[in-house]
């Protein structure tokens, strides 16, 4: 056998080159046939009407033909025949790769609530061979479950990702990335997660700055509440007691002027949104005013008093007890 061919892999729409090569040429005729065994070329003559076949080289040692705009129907065995005695035949297999036509990502709901599990689907349509789908949340790879559907030698792959969302996932992209021999570079599509979460509450003492609360002083506390959607209600309450008469509430701020010992207690900032309710506590302890010592007549004594301030903030972010978790469906 001195007739040789090589298998060809080509991407749909591109050019395949078929070569029939003779090692020891004796001027025998070379013929190229298609998978239906119709003659494409007999020497330099093309009996087929298909003008996508073009003669690249014709000699006693080679018949080289190009096939432009390859389609999946061109796939199969192409036969080289050498008219020796006895005749020789060799075949080359053309494999056509088809990149996915379309890449679609579908998210179960536009907005999810923290702790909820959502379904994300990605479909790569009509490829050959079947596409491999990879999932990423930001830079972290996740594992999906793929199903392959075959129709007329083409494959549609759907990958399902079940994703439990956390508040940190808000604004993070979920990426569906395909790997396919006909695709060079990165073919991907993404959707950004929108995660609703209950408020996180933090109390800031804005006055006095040194943090020591004495009788007669003023106290200013600011409640910072962050959630999604942004908390609609921020309220101050005094735990197990009435709010002092001289306390002033202004949005997220609580002012208590002219502090006295009866103001001692726990002050709670509560914030809520459609996901849930959370609070943070501030324990107020009012210290005695600084004592003034009258100046001595003869001796000067300097006394240094060190006061230790204990500032305790208790944060409780239980959702569902005081507030209801509600999923938003669109």
């Amino acid at each position: 056998q001195n007739l040789f061919t090589k298998d060809v892999t080509v991407i749909e729409g591109e050019v395949a080159t078929i070569s029939c090569q003779v090692n020891k040429s004796d001027d025998s005729v070379i013929q190229l046939l298609n998978p239906n065994r119709q003659t494409i070329y007999f020497r330099d003559f093309r009996p087929l009407k298909d003008s996508r076949f073009q003669l690249l080289n014709f000699s006693s040692s080679e018949l080289k033909v190009s096939l432009t705009n390859v389609s999946i129907s061109d796939e199969g065995r192409y036969f080289c025949q050498l008219y020796t005695d006895p005749p020789q035949e060799s075949y080359t297999t053309i494999t056509v790769l088809v990149p996915p036509r379309n890449l679609m990502i579908d998210i179960q709901k536009d907005t999810a609530v923290e702790g909820e599990e959502i379904e994300v689907n990605c479909t790569a349509m009509a490829s050959k061979p079947a596409t491999t789908i990879r999932w990423f949340k930001g830079n972290t790879e996740l594992k999906g479950k793929s199903e392959v559907e075959e129709w007329s030698d083409m494959y549609t792959v759907t990958s399902q990702l079940m994703l439990k969302v956390h508040k940190e996932d808000d604004g993070v992209p979920v990426i569906c990335q395909v790997e396919h021999p006909a695709v060079t570079g990165n073919l991907q599509t993404q959707r950004y997660l929108e995660v609703q979460y209950k408020p996180q509450v933090h109390i800031q003492m804005t006055y006095p700055l040194q943090g020591l609360t004495r009788e007669g002083d003023a106290l200013e506390l600011t409640c910072e509440a962050i959630g999604k959607p942004q908390p609609v209600m921020v309220t101050w309450v005094r735990v197990d007691d009435e709010m002092p008469q001289h306390a002033v509430l202004s949005g997220p701020n609580l002012f208590i002027n002219n502090l006295n010992k009866t103001d001692n207690g726990t002050y709670r900032c509560e914030a809520s949104n459609i996901v849930g309710k959370a609070h943070s506590d501030y324990m107020l302890y009012v210290y005695d005013p600084p004592t003034t010592i009258p100046p001595p007549t003869t001796t000067t004594t300097t006394t240094t008093t060190t006061t230790t301030t204990i500032l305790t903030i208790i944060t409780d972010s239980r959702a569902g007890e005081e507030g209801s978790i509600r999923a938003v469906d669109h």
């Epitope: 005729v29 020497r43 330099d44 003559f45 093309r46 009407k49 003008s51 003669l55």
Partner: nanobody, 118 residues
Framework: QVQLVESGGGLVQPGGSLRLSCAAS????????MYWVRQAPGKGLEWVSA????????YYADSVKGRFTISRDNAKNTLYLQMNSLKSEDTAVYYC???????????WGKGTQVTVSS
């Protein structure tokens, strides 16, 4: 101007014979390989036979081997196809063509109809 004119077609019964001719002009006939190609109703083109420049080497498709004979007369610039033991599947339009390495069917004849039927 290149011209290829086929003749000799017609209606024949299965088992019968016909001889097709192709008169060539407008090119140096003796310098080119010559071919017979056919197209059956509703089918693609099928290569039937080939002959080298001098006529010493002939080639046939498996479907006609042993029944058809290709020949040429370089002095008369004519190509022939002797068809024996005709079958109904030989029904087609027969074209003659020359292998000039040029793509397409620009240098083919108009064809002659062969119908094999009882």
């Amino acid at each position: 101007q290149v011209q290829l004119v086929e003749s000799g077609g017609g209606l024949v019964q299965p088992g019968g014979s016909l001889r097709l001719s192709c008169a060539a002009s407008g090119f140096t006939f003796s310098s080119y390989w010559m071919y017979w190609v056919r197209q059956a109703p509703g089918k693609g083109l099928e290569w039937v036979s080939a002959i080298n420049t001098g006529g010493g080497s002939t080639y046939y498709a498996d479907s006609v081997k042993g029944r058809f004979t290709i020949s040429r007369d370089n002095a008369k610039n004519t190509l022939y196809l002797q068809m024996n033991s005709l079958k109904s599947e030989d029904t087609a339009v027969y074209y003659c063509a020359y292998g000039n390495g040029v793509e397409g069917m620009d240098y083919w004849g108009k064809g002659t109809q062969v119908t094999v039927s009882s």
